[in-house]
């Protein structure tokens, strides 16, 4: 690597993937081992942001970019730049403090994350309910009772809808 | 409950092997990193080592890189670590504990146990 | 390796009080920042992880904030099982932790 010439601030000439290493006259150096630059002129480089435990690695890091993560099978980015992992729980289930739970009746949740939320209430859009809700799925709500032909019958519909059970913190 | 106890721990001359244990229990050992952690006499909190699920992934802080070993037993839900070429330096508590496989964070502990290196 | 610099290293203070101690990274670490708390002799507790998250059992008297390179843990009100040694630590790279702070009685 060159020795910079600029006239205003030597460093400004070195590229990306190097830093301007003042204890050998402000050459250009390349970034060490496990560390990066993404922009030019820099007097240091970033370490490498290291992808273990619940993180693996999506992008291997490089003199001139950061490693990215994101978390092995089984968990979930959650938060800027995936600063944390989540369990998965099935559909069907929440997360609580103590591990994955069933959906209470009346509640569903068709991910493998978030909360169980209540089944849609038909009645207040003035619909019926054409297909049962279940602890995977929301219920399908159909014409109201009154678009019905005489002789049809719906589906009698689901008890109130509660809030989701969440274990004490 | 969770539970990380301690063993293994006492006086070494310089140069001298130690071999550390942990025993783990209230949880599923094989779904969780461990790690050794050590604090010197009066000092702060110092990353020394951690090891993946299985075992087959291991690091290491760089001083004591190729005289410390990270290794686990999972059928036995036991965490170890081997050290050779003690120095005085190493003396201090050695904590094991659980990586919460959330976001880098510790959250459970063992009691510690105080290796010391000394003639 | 990331260096993690605490402030103050120790402090005086009373029941009720509101404390708060900076933890500053030697490069930004995002949000892979936890707390720690440590009495004499025992091993530490995690009181927060990932700058902000209030570990399952901590009274809600603690909290943290911050992100990238700069990080406080406040205690609200000072209670008496709160004296202690508290540490900050970077899970973004090879683990490092700060120095300590030792809250004391005034």
């Known amino acids: 690597f060159e020795r910079t010439r600029s006239l205003q601030d030597p460093c400004s000439n070195c590229p990306a993937g190097t830093f301007c290493d003042n204890n050998r006259n402000q050459i250009c150096s390349p970034c060490p081992p496990n560390s990066f630059s993404s922009a030019g002129g820099q007097r240091t480089c970033d370490i490498c942001r290291q992808c273990k435990g619940v993180f693996r690695t999506r992008k291997e890091c490089s003199s001139t970019s950061n490693a990215e993560c994101d978390c092995t099978p089984g968990f979930h980015c959650l938060g800027a730049g995936c600063s944390m992992c989540e369990q998965d729980c099935k559909q069907g289930q929440e997360l609580t403090k103590k591990g994955c739970k069933d959906c209470c009746f009346g509640t569903f949740n068709d991910q493998k994350r978030g909360i169980c939320r209540p089944w849609t209430n038909c009645s207040l859009d003035g619909k019926s309910v054409l297909v049962n809700g279940t602890k995977e799925r929301d219920v399908v709500c159909g014409p109201s009772p009154a678009d019905l032909s005489p002789g049809a019958s719906s589906v009698t519909p689901p008890a109130p809808a509660r809030e989701p059970g969440h274990s004490p913190q | 409950q969770v539970q990380l106890v301690q063993s293994g721990g006492g006086l070494v001359q310089p140069g001298g092997s130690l071999r550390l244990s942990c025993a783990a229990s209230g949880f599923t050992f094989t779904n969780f990193w461990m790690d050794w952690v050590r604090q010197a006499p009066g000092k702060g909190l110092e990353w020394v080592a951690d090891?993946?699920?299985?075992?087959?992934?291991?690091y290491y802080v760089d001083s004591v890189k190729g005289r410390f070993t990270i290794s686990r037993d999972n059928a036995g839900n036991s965490l170890y670590l081997q050290m050779n070429s003690l120095r005085a330096e190493d003396t201090a508590v050695y904590y094991c504990?659980?990586?919460?496989?959330?976001?880098?964070?510790?959250?459970?502990w063992g009691q510690g146990t105080l290796v010391t290196v000394s003639s | 390796a990331i260096q993690m610099t605490q402030s103050p290293s120790s402090l005086s203070a009373s029941v009720g009080d509101r404390v708060t101690i900076t933890c500053r990274a030697s490069q930004s670490i995002s949000s892979y920042l936890n707390w720690y708390q440590q009495k004499p002799g025992k091993a530490p507790k995690l009181l927060i992880y990932?700058?902000?998250s209030l570990q399952s059992g901590v009274p809600s008297r603690f909290s943290g904030s911050g992100s990238g390179t700069d990080f406080t843990l406040t205690i609200s009100s000072l209670q008496p099982e709160d004296f202690a040694t508290y540490y900050c630590q970077q899970s973004y790279s090879t683990p490092t932790f700060g120095q300590g702070t030792k809250v004391e009685i005034k």
């Open positions: 504990a659980r990586d919460a496989m959330r976001g880098g964070d510790l959250d459970y």
């Open positions: 090891i993946n699920k299985d075992g087959g992934e291991k």
């Open positions: 990932a700058a902000s």
